[in-house]
């Protein structure tokens, strides 16, 4: 077989699959957590019913040097239609409470599981 350079582009991941993969990654993080996640870093809590994916990314992107959540950050960047940079907060983001990354991940996971059960893949 001859390699013609590059890889065949995989088909787009259906929203249901993308959501399931994110849930699996968050489960992985919570189950493998030994020491405090991201050294106990604090992030802004978000309204999980309002523009959740971009808001979650805007919060988590401010955590740097934490390999445990890098894959989650990458996945969430694909879930948001606009580019998110550290220090950026959209109008959907209410910055009033900070919580530990571990708690943020647990809250996000519970909400995503609920959405998945209800078949809300949008």
């Amino acid at each position: 077989l001859t390699c013609l350079g590059g890889f065949a582009s995989p088909g787009p991941v259906p929203p249901s699959t993308a959501l399931r993969e994110l849930i699996e990654e968050l489960v992985n993080i919570t189950q493998n957590q030994k020491a405090p996640l991201c050294n106990g870093s604090m992030v802004w809590s978000i309204n999980l019913t309002a523009g959740m994916y971009c808001a979650a990314l805007e919060s988590l992107i401010n955590v740097s040097g934490c390999s445990a959540i890098e894959k989650t950050q990458r996945m969430l960047s694909g879930f948001c239609p606009h580019k998110v940079s550290a220090g950026q907060f959209s109008s959907l983001h209410v910055r009033d409470t900070k919580i530990e990354v571990a708690q943020f991940v647990k809250d996000l996971l519970l909400h995503l599981k609920k959405l998945f059960r209800e078949g809300q893949f949008n």
Epitope: P12, P15, L19, G51, G78, P81, H82, K83, G119, N122
Partner: antibody, heavy 118, light 109 residues
């Protein structure tokens, strides 16, 4: 002033490949996702996909994923859309557009008309 | 894949009010669909009116407003002007891709 200037109209035969460029000015392309939209004559808008020019990461609409390739050159602030295996139903105007939260799809290229005809 | 449906055409009197809706085949539209509304006139590129469900673009007149209404995204035009006659499209984000609506032709008559 923000501007997106696209390459000129193309007339191509079925089976050919087209490459459309979108040269931006007034902003740095790597700071934004660039989206591409198709509009066939007298028809509605159809989202093709988007690219993060900073790392080349792409998302494609299911309809286009096997024939379209989005790329970007951050050194020249230019985004590209390549569509292969052209067929008559690909005859359309193709737009590039900048997307960010505070002005999604606020800036559009002038459109590039691609005509596929034998 | 989801289908996003709009009313094919609507007519409004000058000064009147009309509401355009954007329905998702997969269920209720939410703020995580980041609904966008566009106006397009013949021979022109689309122009964003509303983004993120209910935020007006800087150039959007106050007579246009966006909302969620009965599980659909909605665009309300209050006090229609002759220049508002155009095609209107919505676009919804589905986790990793946009889908545009079928479009609504608004006639001001």
């Amino acid at each position: 002033e923000v501007q997106l200037v696209q390459s000129g109209a193309e007339v191509l035969k079925p089976g050919a490949t087209v490459l459309i460029s979108c040269k931006v000015s007034g902003f740095t392309i790597k700071d934004y996702y660039m989206h591409w939209v198709q509009q066939a004559p007298g028809k509605g808008l159809e989202w093709i996909g988007r690219i993060d020019p900073e790392d080349g990461e792409t998302k494609y609409a299911p309809k286009f994923h096997d024939r379209v390739t989005l790329t970007a050159d951050t050194s020249t602030d230019t985004a590209y859309m390549e569509l292969s295996s052209l067929r008559s139903e690909d005859t359309a105007v193709y737009y590039c557009t900048r997307y960010d939260y505070y002005g999604p799809f606020a800036y559009w290229g002038q459109g590039t008309l691609v005509t596929v005809s034998s | 894949q989801a289908v996003v449906t709009q009313e094919p055409s609507l007519t409004v009197s000058p000064g009147g009010t009309v509401t355009l809706t954007c329905r998702s085949s997969t269920g209720a539209v939410t703020t995580s669909n980041y609904a966008n509304w566009f106006q397009q006139k013949p021979g022109q590129a689309p122009r964003t009116l509303i983004y993120g469900t209910n935020n007006r673009a800087p150039w959007t007149p106050a007579r246009f407003s966006g909302s969620l209404l009965g599980g659909k995204a909605a665009l309300t035009l209050s006090g229609a002007q002759p220049e508002d006659e155009a095609e209107y499209y919505c676009a919804l984000w589905y986790i990793n891709h946009f889908i545009f609506g079928t479009g609504t032709k608004v006639t001001v008559l």
